[in-house]
Interface confidence: medium
Amino acid sequence: QVKPCDFPDIKHGGLFHENMRRPYFPVAVGKYYSYYCDEHFETPSGSYWDYIHCTQNGWSPAVPCLRKCYFPYLENGYNQNYGRKFVQGNSTEVACHPGYGLPKAQTTVTCTEKGWSPTPRCIRVRTCSKSDIEIENGFISESSSIYILNKEIQYKCKPGYATADGNSSGSITCLQNGWSAQPICINSSEKCGPPPPISNGDTTSFLLKVYVPQSRVEYQCQPYYELQGSNYVTCSNGEWSEPPRCIHPCIITEENMNKNNIKLKGRSDRKYYAKTGDTIEFMCKLGYNANTSILSFQAVCREGIVEYPRCE
């Protein structure tokens, strides 16, 4: 049985002759209807109208009306995109004159349903001062004291110290909100490699090859597995703190229930997942009587193991 389509809710547009058509919904797969988009929006084909059609997966296109954004004139910027049309989801780089940039040191703008984000404009950007740099166990040999936006400066670490990725020197960049980072020169022995892998779980972030002291990494478990311990590990003195465990769920199967002539109380699931500590309520199938204690019908999941009650 193929699911029919309900009346389409076309954001920023609508069906032609909408009121005449509304009573005939839901409609069968394969039906086509012409629709229009409001001002500032267009169809995926770039027109102000097109056809929307009912498929097995619902209406196609899924987003019938896309925002149009026209690139504005940039004061204090390069205007190679001036007047160009961009469609919802498109991004483009904004090139500002030296000393100018987008707010918050961003370099790209995106056409969204509500228009440009952020608004393309070039504002005066601040410079960075050498006096704002704190460097322990290293030094900067550059002579200037003021640096313009996007200027990169090098620093060197003392012998026995290294940057986060194990080099004897590194660089920082002057950004809209100040320096990209403070220079890091750390005692080599205090760094950590990637955090330990865990069974049935993973880190939530991409793995680096080297981590600086006090780095924190978060773990998550696979669906239905329960995280036991701290979500986070911390790098300290070259070692990670104890990672969490992902505890097996109990999988209550129809096969095991049939063997014991029981069923789930108040549920009709063929397969049911329970976490450690969860109570699973069973009852005898029709025509069977309890063969184990009344308490056993409130079974508790313990790290993937559940003791089923029995009915005869």
């Epitope: 290294a162 986060a164 990725d165 194990g166 080099n167 080599s188 022995s189 760094k191 490699g193 990637p194 892998p197 993973d202 880190t203 991409f206 793995l207 680096l208 090859k209 080297v210 070259g238």
Partner: antibody
């Protein structure tokens, strides 16, 4: 031209330790921009990354969770090589073992250089 | 761990044709962290593409990679006789995992 030369026995008895060595020429095992890995390939498991060793002002070892309790990868700076030791082997560990180099940066792990592979059979 | 599923399992094409190989991840992979390899019988895998779309040194420009999120594609624009082999994708964002491979054979 950088090359990786593998050596080690092709037959190991169950419960014993599988040991392979990978000699590096044209690069250094203690390079600050490379990582040295072992990967195996079998019909049942496909390509499986086992672990890596690398130097970033100190030595780091990272192992796959599937073999974590049984594996050791050791660098040998004097011979410019690295080795794999996998203990308590079973017939499941029968595979072609490759040593590889990864020259990805701090975030990247991909393998631009591979040894020729050693077929290791675990059988009594 | 992230599971990579490659399709089709086998692709039969003729020299000169265009090949499109797919790699789908069980969860989102940053496009920076996907690589493609080629392996011929009796040989080691060879790196073709890293960072989803950057060609490795010495790889002909008929090989190109694209994609982001969970769907990635390796395209060979015009098949040469030496391109018939098995192709693997690999992610290296969280640990390291490989796809099961696509065998590209001569039709």
């Amino acid at each position: 031209q950088v090359q990786l030369q593998q050596s080690g026995p092709g037959l190991v008895k169950p419960s014993q330790t599988l040991s392979l060595t990978c000699a590096i020429s044209g690069d250094s095992v203690s390079s600050n921009s490379a990582s040295w890995n072992w990967i195996r390939q079998s019909p049942s498991r496909g390509l499986e990354w086992l672990g890596t060793t690398y130097y970033r002002s100190k030595w780091f070892n990272v192992y796959a969770v599937s073999v974590k309790s049984r594996i050791t990868i050791n660098p040998d700076t004097s011979k410019n090589q690295f080795s794999l030791h996998l203990n308590s082997v079973t017939p499941e560990d029968t595979a072609i073992y490759f040593c590889t180099r990864d020259r990805g940066d701090l975030l990247h792990w991909y393998f631009d250089l591979w040894g020729r592979g050693t077929l290791v059979t675990v059988s009594s | 761990e992230i599971v990579l599923t490659q399709s089709p399992g086998t692709l039969s094409l003729s020299p000169g044709e265009r090949a499109t190989l797919s790699c789908r991840a069980s969860q989102s992979v940053s496009s920076s962290y996907l690589a493609w390899y080629q392996q011929k019988p009796g040989q080691s895998p060879r790196l073709l593409i890293y960072g989803a779309s950057s060609r490795a040194t010495g790889i002909p420009d008929r090989f190109s990679g694209s994609g982001s999120g969970t769907d990635f594609t390796l395209t060979i624009s015009r098949l040469e006789p030496e391109d018939f082999a098995v192709y693997y994708c690999q992610q290296y964002g969280r640990s390291v995992t490989f796809g099961g491979g696509t065998k590209l054979e001569i039709k």
